[in-house]
C-alpha cells in the first residue's frame, strides 16, 4: 500500500522539513523562515509559536519541530506544552483573583502554586498533633492519647507528616 | 492569529498619568479575562490589574491600587490601563495578556501576550 500510495502521491515523498508545493508541480520545498512540518508528506508547513511577553523560548524552533515555551521567573506553566503561565506566590499564599494572599488559619501550601488545603485532622486518625500547622506547612501528627499515658510499654514514633496530595489546577 | 498590540508607553515625570491602550485581534476577546503584566529593569514579571469579561470586577496589585485603572471595550476589543499619580518604581515594560475563558485551566494563567509598551517615570 505505501509503495503504491507514494507512486500515485508525490507529495509523500517530501520529507519533514519541508512541504509539498502545489505551486511548484508538487515539488518538495524547504519549509519558510519561521514554519515547521514535523512529519513527511505535508501540503504546508506550520507557522512556529512565539514565545514573547510572559513566554520565554527554552527550544527555539527548526524547519522540523515547534518552538517550545515555558513562563518567565515568577510564573509558572499550566496546561499541555505550557499553554499558559501563572503567576507563582509564596509558600503558605494561593492565587487569588487579587494576587497572591496568605492561608486562612487553619490551612496551609508548601508550594509556590495550588491552593491552601486544610491542615491534617489528627484525631481522625486517633492521634495527637505533635508539631503545630502554620501557613506553609502541615501538622505532624504524634502517637495516640493513650499511648503516652504512663501505663504504656513504649512510645509509637511519630507518623511522618502527611504527603499532601497536588491540588487540581 | 492571536494579537495582542499595546501603546501609549513613554516618559513622564513622577506624579503624572499616562493610558496604555491594547489592540486585540484573532479571538473572541468578549469572552476572556484580561490582564496587565508589568517587567520592570533587572526584576521578574509583576501581575498589575486583571479584568473580567465584562469589566464587572477588577483586581489591582496592592502597589497600584487607587492609582490605576483598568478597563475594556469589547465593542472595539481593546483594553486600557490608566496610570495616575506614577512613580518612579512604576517604570517597567507593560504587557497586556489574555487570561482564562470560563472554560480554561486557570482564570488566572496567561495564554497569550503582546511585544510590550515601556514606560518611564522619572524626576
Known amino acids: 500500500f505505501e509503495r503504491t500510495r507514494s507512486l500515485q502521491d508525490p507529495c509523500s515523498n517530501c520529507p519533514a522539513g519541508t512541504f509539498c508545493d502545489n505551486n511548484r508541480n508538487q515539488i518538495c520545498s524547504p519549509c519558510p523562515p519561521n514554519s515547521f512540518s514535523s512529519a513527511g508528506g505535508q501540503r504546508t508547513c506550520d507557522i512556529c509559536r512565539q514565545c514573547k511577553g510572559v513566554f520565554r523560548t527554552r527550544k527555539e524552533c527548526s524547519s522540523t519541530s515547534n518552538a517550545e515555551c515555558d513562563c518567565t521567573p515568577g510564573f509558572h506553566c499550566l496546561g499541555a506544552g505550557c499553554s499558559m503561565c501563572e503567576q507563582d506566590c509564596k509558600q503558605g499564599q494561593e492565587l487569588t483573583k487579587k494576587g497572591c494572599k496568605d492561608c486562612c488559619f487553619g490551612t496551609f501550601n508548601d508550594q509556590k502554586r495550588g491552593i491552601c488545603r486544610p491542615w491534617t485532622n489528627c484525631s481522625l486518625d486517633g492521634k495527637s498533633v505533635l508539631v503545630n500547622g502554620t501557613k506553609e506547612r502541615d501538622v505532624v501528627c504524634g502517637p495516640s492519647p493513650a499511648d503516652l499515658s504512663p501505663g504504656a510499654s513504649s512510645v509509637t514514633p511519630p507518623a511522618p507528616a502527611r504527603e499532601p496530595g497536588h491540588s487540581p489546577q | 492569529e492571536v494579537q495582542l498590540v499595546e501603546s501609549g508607553g513613554g516618559l513622564v515625570q513622577i506624579g503624572g498619568s499616562l493610558r496604555l491602550s491594547c489592540a486585540a485581534s484573532?479571538?473572541?476577546?468578549?469572552k476572556y479575562w484580561m490582564i496587565w503584566v508589568r517587567q520592570a529593569p533587572e526584576k521578574g514579571l509583576e501581575w498589575?490589574?486583571?479584568?473580567?469579561?465584562?469589566?464587572?470586577?477588577?483586581y489591582y496589585v496592592d502597589s497600584v491600587e487607587g492609582r490605576f485603572t483598568i478597563s475594556r471595550d469589547n465593542a472595539n476589543n481593546s483594553l486600557f490601563l490608566q496610570m495616575n499619580s506614577l512613580r518612579a518604581e512604576d517604570t517597567a515594560v507593560y504587557y497586556c495578556?489574555?487570561?482564562?475563558?470560563?472554560?480554561?485551566?486557570?482564570?488566572?494563567?496567561?495564554?497569550?501576550s503582546g511585544q510590550g509598551t515601556r514606560v518611564t517615570v522619572s524626576s
Open positions: 484573532g479571538f473572541t476577546f468578549s
Open positions: 495578556a489574555r487570561g482564562g475563558d470560563d472554560y480554561s485551566i486557570s482564570h488566572f494563567g496567561m495564554d497569550v
Open positions: 498589575v490589574a486583571n479584568i473580567n469579561q465584562d469589566g464587572s470586577e477588577k
